[in-house]
């Protein structure tokens, strides 16, 4: 008779990232038998929650069930029905969560208590949903990406994974971007650290490794809009506001309200003598780019180098894989090819945003004018965050790779979450097993 | 099942205002945008404006804006619609209806739920 | 704003035969992304509309696929093969691509 292979041992495991401005479910698989070796889980599917984020539901909680069942009922029909109670879910929260949290504790429960009820009604192994913290986010998000590029594995290969992979064993930095917070994570080249509070130690498949960590909260591109809104209608003579962010000819009316909302514009709050303004967008990246250097608070520093207000960053060190937003805003602009040096990229933000709104709204049709006008802004607000805020220099850039996926898994923080909480990453290398895994009858 | 309530009709003096209701059920309210249409006796169909319920942003018609403003109160899953300065141009059955996007909640999506709609009329 | 053309009447159809409505833009609602932003809309007696067609070929959910729709950038066809008494009613094109959003005249659909 002919030899069969044997049927694998399938294993799943489930993270919904729960971000500032929407939620993503992410399945992910591996073979049981080499749950510990490095590279074998990879992501199966992921289902955007229609909608907005968790927080927005802390006046509509009775709705999060009804929020997240698409995306949950995608998940049991992804993953076979004899598998469904033992496949682990986990929710992780981030930025949009913790500045719920600022404002009130009691309402962040209260949400998070409705979304662990929901998913607990699924046939599921849920594990508990939780708000994150930016130290993890960023760390999380460093394994996730030298996972998937193969960087833990000890074994040297002669073919590279991905293009810009350099089959050294030397870790990517991570740098994320969301709605809320922004994380920097790496491998500086000095192992002292000046700062505690950023220091990470980890011992992964038998090596050392210590990182450099910080989440910037209220950094993420949504929230630094509001800041930058609030810190300019503050000298804005009337209710117009001239904004060199937005393309010329944009209109759009703002509610003061709406702008002190957020925790993140306190510090720019102040009695303005009308309710509503309008921003008439007048697109000039030079001045959109001052406008978010003030942002950045750069005239102090207690330490031998600093990122932005005050919080120490040692000298950047090696490649660095830039994703979540710094890919979408990126792509979009279609910014992302490894050929396009830092010049290039300013050329063509300059050219982006003096656009006129009536040609931008023409060329991207598709696009909802409510995202399609913040993209001049965004891409500022990148460039102005790699290069002033971390210290990318036109040389430098080169080293950041806009990375959406890797080897098909999307980079973020969810899959390094999943294999730490599912304890797949062993402290030690595991020992080689000399036979192969297939076994035949 | 997903439904769209709307008050059936709303009877007003010339120069007042009105203030109509779009009560939704079935679904989660600030996930999906939702749009005014006007319809006046024997005419075709005429676009009012749309609100994201998630933060209120909204868009309008020229021709509506001063005349419309949208709301939503999201505590009740209810979108409003203000009209002011009513005169018998007004006079019309305005619908609410929802907007789906599919995935890519940054496209601009068809309108797939209608509500029964509001017949107003600017009598004196 | 892009102007939404429609005949108001479109010849009255027998049951069980095909029927045509036509439908022209002011300008191309052909994107170079590939995308055409026609929509079909059908409003039957005493309620309110409903999706037929979005993005000129797709046919929305719980339609028969008896509905189709071609077209150009500008001149669309809504075609009903196998006319059944329910499909009477007003037939809307209407265009997304930009705001505001546009709808036609409407074409009524009658029977013999």
């Known amino acids: 008779t002919q030899n069969k292979a044997l049927p694998e041992n399938i294993k799943y495991g489930i993270v919904l990232d729960a971000g500032s401005s929407h939620t993503s479910l992410y399945i992910y698989k591996w073979p049981a038998e080499k749950e510990n070796d490095t590279g074998v889980v990879h992501q199966v599917e992921e289902c955007r929650v229609k909608g907005p984020g968790i927080s927005k539901y802390v006046q509509k909680v009775n709705e999060i069930g009804i929020y997240l069942t698409d995306c949950m009922e995608r998940a049991r029909e992804v993953i076979p029905r004899s598998q469904h109670q033992e496949t682990p879910v986990y929710l992780g929260a981030t930025a949009g969560m913790r500045l719920l949290r600022m404002e009130s504790e009691e309402l962040a429960d209260r949400v998070l208590d409705v979304v662990e009820r929901s998913l607990s009604n699924y046939p599921f192994d849920f594990q508990g949903a939780r708000i994150i913290t930016g130290q993890e986010e960023g760390a999380y998000g460093w394994i996730t990406i030298n996972y998937l590029l193969g960087k833990f594995s000890q074994k040297t290969r002669w073919f590279s994974i991905v293009p810009y992979e350099t089959n050294n064993q030397e870790t990517f930095g991570a740098l994320d971007l969301g709605g809320a917070s922004t994380q920097i994570t790496f491998v500086p080249q000095n192992q002292t650290t000046e700062s505690p509070d950023n220091a990470l130690q980890f011992r992964l498949y038998g090596k050392d490794y210590n990182v450099y960590t910080h989440s910037f909260l209220c950094y993420g591109k949504d929230q630094a809009l509001w800041q930058k809104l609030a810190k300019d209608i503050q000298v804005a003579s009337n209710e117009i506001l001239r904004d060199p962010c937005f393309h010329p000819g944009y209109k759009k009316v703002v509610n003061v309200s709406d702008l002190y909302k957020t925790p993140c514009t306190k510090r720019f709050e102040m009695t303005l003598p009308f309710q509503q303004f309008e921003i008439q967008g007048i697109g000039n990246y030079q001045q959109c780019h001052q406008s978010v250097l003030e942002l950045f608070n750069t005239s102090y520093c207690p330490y031998s180098q600093c990122a932005f207000n005050g919080i120490f960053l040692p000298p950047l060190q090696g490649d660095f894989g830039a994703f979540s937003a710094f890919y979408f805003v990126m792509n979009f602009l279609n910014l992302t090819s490894e050929k396009v040096s830092q010049e290039k990229v300013t050329e063509m933000m300059k050219k982006f945003c003096s656009q006129p709104w009536e040609e931008i709204k023409t060329s991207y049709a598709g696009v909802k004018e409510k995202y399609l006008s913040e993209y001049c802004f965004s891409g500022t607000y990148i460039l102005s965050l790699l290069l002033q805020g971390y210290h990318f220099t036109a040389d430098s850039w080169e080293h950041i790779h806009f990375i959406g996926k890797i080897q098909g898994s999307d980079a973020g923080w969810t899959l390094g979450y999943m294999l730490n909480l599912t304890n797949m990453i062993p402290a030690e290398q595991p020992l080689s097993t000399p036979l192969s895994h297939s076994t035949y009858v | 099942q997903v439904q769209l309530q709307q008050p059936g009709t709303e009877l007003v003096m010339p120069g007042a205002s009105v203030t109509l209701s779009c009560k939704a059920s079935?679904?989660?309210?600030?996930?999906?945008?939702m749009h005014w249409v006007k319809q006046r006796p024997g005419q075709g169909l005429e676009w009012i404006g749309e609100?994201?319920?998630?933060?209120?942003?909204?868009n309008y018609n020229q021709n509506f804006k001063g005349k419309a403003t949208l709301t939503v109160d999201r505590s009740s899953s209810t979108a409003y619609m203000q009209l002011n300065s009513l005169t018998s141009e007004d006079s019309a059955v305005y619908y609410c209806?929802?907007?789906?996007?599919?995935?890519?909640?940054?496209?601009?999506?068809?309108?797939?739920?209608w509500g029964t709609g509001t017949t107003v009329t600017v009598s004196s | 704003d892009i102007v939404m053309t429609q005949t108001a009447f479109s010849n009255p159809v027998t049951l069980g035969t095909s029927a045509s409505i036509s439908c022209r833009s002011s300008?191309?609602?052909?994107?170079?992304?590939?995308?055409?932003?026609l929509y079909w809309y059908l409003q039957k007696p005493g309620q309110s509309p409903q999706v037929l067609i979005y993005?000129?070929?797709n046919l929305a959910s719980g339609v028969p696929d008896r509905f189709s729709c071609s077209g150009s950038g500008t001149d669309f066809t809504l075609r009903i093969t196998r006319v059944e008494a329910e499909d009477v009613g007003f037939y809307y094109c209407?265009?997304?691509?930009?705001?505001?959003?546009?709808f036609g005249g409407g074409t009524k659909l009658e029977m013999k």
């Open positions: 300008k191309s609602l052909l994107h170079s992304n590939g995308i055409t932003y």
């Open positions: 993005q000129m070929s």
């Open positions: 209806a929802r907007e789906e996007n599919g995935i890519y909640y940054y496209n601009k999506g068809y309108l797939d739920v």
């Open positions: 609100i994201d319920p998630s933060d209120d942003y909204t």
């Open positions: 079935g679904y989660s309210f600030i996930s999906y945008w």
């Open positions: 209407a265009q997304n691509l930009e705001l505001p959003y546009t």
